[in-house]
Interface confidence: low
């Protein structure tokens, strides 16, 4: 059974870059789309973007200028970088898998990131 | 690796009868990735059911799929002469069952 595990620093300073990694176990990164979603405290879900392991990607326009996603197939990991963070980027960040741009069928457990000096 | 075992190997029935084909997995399978295919002589297989229970486009509603975990079933409620073929179950991106031949009695 496929499992996703997010990892990264829990605290990031304003204006710095947030870096998160999602490790996939129980399945190959190939043939799926991989997404990042976040959820600010007490709020709803916001889709950050997805990429296909072969190199295709699509990001939420509201975050596009600050987002980079990449994959390391040798480690079965994919990552998120979010630049120039502010307090508004404080959230629980989830990685998730989908079938060819479709519904998010498997999610990581989420990792909390606080942006504060 | 997951092994899919289909039974019976051959099923002999008459048109109008109900056919029940079984597919058993050696370990639990996510039914979202369990498909059934129909293959007629000289033709490529075509998908009948995907996600264990969803009929593929153009498949008549006499075909239905069910099951979860390790036990899956393909049912044809009233056999039409054109339904006589070999049926395979498969976990996507992985192995197929060995097939069930549905023949006219």
């Amino acid at each position: 059974q496929v499992q996703l595990q997010e990892s990264g620093p829990g605290l990031v300073k304003p204006s710095e870059t947030l870096s998160l990694t999602c490790t996939v176990s129980g399945d190959s990164i190939s043939d799926y789309y991989w997404s990042w979603i976040r959820q600010p405290p007490g709020k709803g879900l916001e889709w950050i973007g997805y990429f296909f392991y072969s190199g295709g990607s699509n990001y939420n326009p509201s975050l596009k200028s600050r987002v980079t996603m990449s994959v390391d197939t040798s480690k079965n990991q994919f990552s998120l970088k979010l630049g120039s963070v502010t307090a508004a980027d404080t959230a629980v960040y989830y990685c998730a898998r989908s079938q060819l741009r479709y519904y998010l069928d498997v999610w990581g457990q989420g990792t909390t990131v606080t942006v504060s000096s | 690796e997951i092994v899919l075992t289909q039974s019976p190997g051959t099923l002999s029935l008459s048109p109008g009868e109900r056919a029940t084909l079984s597919c058993r997995a050696s370990q639990s399978v996510d039914s979202n990735y369990l498909a059934w295919y129909q293959q007629k002589p000289g033709q490529a297989p075509r998908v009948v059911i995907y996600g264990a229970s969803n009929r593929a486009t153009g498949i008549p509603d006499r075909f239905s799929g069910s099951g979860s975990g390790t036990e899956f079933t393909l049912t044809i409620s009233r056999l039409d002469p054109e339904d006589f073929a070999v049926y395979y179950c498969q976990q996507y991106g992985s192995f197929f069952g060995q097939g069930t031949r549905l023949e006219i009695k």
Partner: antibody, heavy 119, light 107 residues
Framework: EVQLQQSGPELVKPGASMKISCKAS????????MNWVKQSHGKNLEWIGL????????SYNQKFKGKATLTVDKSSSTAYMELLSLTSEDSAVYYC????????????WGQGTLVTVSA | DIVMTQSHKFMSTSVGGRVSITCKAS??????VAWYQQKPGQSPKLLIY???YRYTGVPDRFTGSGSGTDFTFTFSSVQAEDLAVYYC?????????FGGGTKLEIK
């Protein structure tokens, strides 16, 4: 309309190698992985492996490692499978297949290529 | 962007009760809508995809319906463990967007 057009039947001698082609049309070739499936003498289907045409990363059923090599030519939207050191056990019909959009099954199949290995 | 609106932030019902959560898309999304359940401290879990298909292992007391712009998620008989927030999401066009969520409370 999605179509997968495979090369014609082949009669080859034991020990030889040969290559089957699968020309894709009706969709963006690099958007979907291409799968290959073996069917021996009208019997069971076996998944051989898949290749992602975008970055040419392939994944194989362990059983076919060393037997099959998957490649693509993006310029002609064609996938290839080379079968190595053929024996009578390799006599079969070989299919290329692609899954449907957002679904977990092979929705599109080539017509099949019959390979006969005989002295 | 397509806006997904869940008009009720909260819904309250008794165990065994029937309740429906609605979701409205700002434009036609055909049937490209998924529903997720999120329990406190947990990540979302897929329940329904393509508007009406139950995902693997989801109990049949959960059903989804709708097409175009209006979608409904229905509990035929609410159980205590259904206490959660429910989100709709469109997977019709980029960027994918979610509804604001509806919290199901048990009386």
């Amino acid at each position: 309309e999605v179509q997968l057009q495979q090369s014609g039947p082949e009669l080859v001698k034991p020990g030889a190698s040969m290559k089957i082609s699968c020309k894709a049309s009706g969709y963006s070739f690099t958007d979907y992985t291409m799968n290959w499936v073996k069917q021996s003498h009208g019997k069971n289907l076996e998944w051989i492996g898949l290749i992602n045409p975008y970055n040419v990363i392939s994944s194989y059923n362990q059983k076919f490692k060393g037997k099959a090599t998957l490649t693509v030519d993006k310029s002609s939207s064609t996938a290839y499978m080379e079968l190595l050191s053929l024996t009578s056990e390799d006599s079969a019909v070989y299919y290329c297949a692609r899954k449907g959009y957002g679904s977990s099954m092979f929705a599109y199949w080539g017509q099949g290529t019959l390979v006969t290995v005989s002295a | 962007d397509i806006v997904m609106t869940q008009s009720h932030k909260f819904m309250s019902t008794s165990v065994g009760g029937r309740v429906s959560i609605t979701c409205k898309a700002s434009q036609d999304v055909t049937t490209a809508v998924a529903w997720y359940q999120q329990k406190p401290g947990q990540s979302p879990k897929l329940l329904i995809y393509s508007a009406s298909y139950r995902y693997t292992g989801v109990p049949d007391r959960f059903t989804g319906s709708g097409s175009g712009t209006d979608f409904t998620f229905t509990f035929s008989s609410v159980q205590a463990e259904d206490l959660a927030v429910y989100y709709c999401q469109q997977h019709y066009s980029i960027p994918w967007t979610f509804g604001g969520g509806t919290k199901l409370e048990i009386k």
